[in-house]
Amino acid sequence: PEPPTACREKQYLINSQCCSLCQPGQKLVSDCTEFTETECLPCGESEFLDTWNRETHCHQHKYCDPNLGLRVQQKGTSETDTICTCEEGWHCTSEACESCVLHRSCSPGFGVKQIATGVSDTICEPCPVGFFSNVSSAFEKCHPWTSCETKDLVVQQAGTNKTDVVCGPQDRLRA
């Protein structure tokens, strides 16, 4: 028979022979022959391969370096890499999460629209009319101005995006 030029899924072509790929979590030791199946070996401790493959070396699990603010979110297996995330108050600088930076705080006049996670930074928004923030914070949203009316008070000083209104007593009309 003619030697194959293409192989089935989960196979590879080597020296005119279709050989089975190694399953995830295993590496290639020896190609198949007409008489012998592909020889694969499980990845060692702290190694992985996440696809059907013909790799002769497994990949090392990612190291979550605490000196870079990283910690393990999900421990790696022979088939998956370790997933790192950042310590509380920090977030990843990239999708690969190779290092962390401190969460950004929202300055006065801005409030937190979305609290930061281990993988995304704080999202701030300007406080709209009727709201204010007088602190630099990674958690505080814009607060609504105090409603003087509901306290039977009147506005003595108008609010801004950084300050609340100042309420005061109503002037009593003299008879």
Epitope: S30, D31, C32, E34, F35, T36
Partner: antibody
Framework: QVQLVESGGGVVQPGRSLRLSCAAS????????MHWVRQAPGKCLEWVAV????????YYADSVKGRFTISRDNSKNTLYLQMNSLRAEDTAVYYC??????????WGQGTMVTVSS | EIVLTQSPGTLSLSPGERATLSCRAS???????LAWYQQKPGQAPRLLIY???ARANGIPDRFSGSGSGTDFTLTISRLEPEDFAVYYC??????????FGCGTKVEIK
């Protein structure tokens, strides 16, 4: 450890039969092709036969074709060589060896077959 | 059938010397599927080199293989006392039959 151990050799008269066995241990026997190779006293190595991992494919040297049969029992991790119509020129040490894309990487210690009247 | 011719038949050398063994094929050996084996008296052959130039597991680096097509060489850079033995080449590309050369004996001078 990975090991192959042959047995069944001995002295036999011409025209008679003998069955050699090769017991495998330390590896997944059912994933490997297996060979028989022989060596007449003071002579070169001569390939005899091969069988595929599941026992479907078998090839023989012309010198033994029609007289020798290679077989295997994966449940017993054992390879066999049935030798019929033996001749004086079949006198040799018979080795079993493991098939890989790297050649014959593991060999047994051999078993001696003497064909003599 | 691929016929393998090994030369010389015998090589007489002293420990520490370099040994060069030749294996010539009657036709090209596909994919360089050529192996070298070492055999000592009363023992089974041991795989040294496969794919013409790759050392098998546990084989010291003084053993090296080279060549392709029809001409192959096994070199032992500095002979140790335990290296005196018979060396066989074998092709496993074109079968049946898998063929062996008739060996080169490396003996102490």
């Amino acid at each position: 450890q990975v090991q192959l151990v042959e047995s069944g050799g001995g002295v036999v008269q011409p025209g008679r039969s003998l069955r050699l066995s090769c017991a495998a241990s330390g590896f997944t026997f059912g994933s490997y092709g297996m060979h028989w190779v022989r060596q007449a006293p003071g002579k070169c190595l001569e390939w005899v036969a091969v069988i595929s991992y599941e026992g479907v494919k078998k090839y023989y040297a012309d010198s033994v074709k029609g007289r020798f049969t290679i077989s295997r029992d994966n449940s017993k991790n054992t390879l066999y060589l049935q030798m019929n119509s033996l001749r004086a020129e079949d006198t040799a040490v018979y080795y079993c060896a493991r098939d890989t894309s790297r050649g014959h990487d593991i060999w047994g210690q051999g078993t001696m077959v003497t064909v003599s009247s | 059938e691929i016929v393998l011719t090994q030369s010389p038949g015998t090589l007489s050398l002293s420990p520490g010397e370099r040994a060069t063994l030749s294996c010539r094929a009657s036709q090209s050996v596909s994919y360089d599927y050529l192996a070298w084996y070492q055999q000592k008296p009363g023992q089974a052959p041991r795989l040294l080199i496969y794919g013409a130039s790759a050392r098998a597991n546990g084989i010291p680096d003084r053993f090296s293989g080279s060549g392709s097509g029809t001409d192959f060489t096994l070199t032992i850079s500095r002979l140790e006392p335990e290296d005196f033995a018979v060396y066989y080449c074998q092709q496993y590309a074109d079968y049946p039959p898998f063929t062996f050369g008739c060996g080169t004996k490396v003996e102490i001078k």
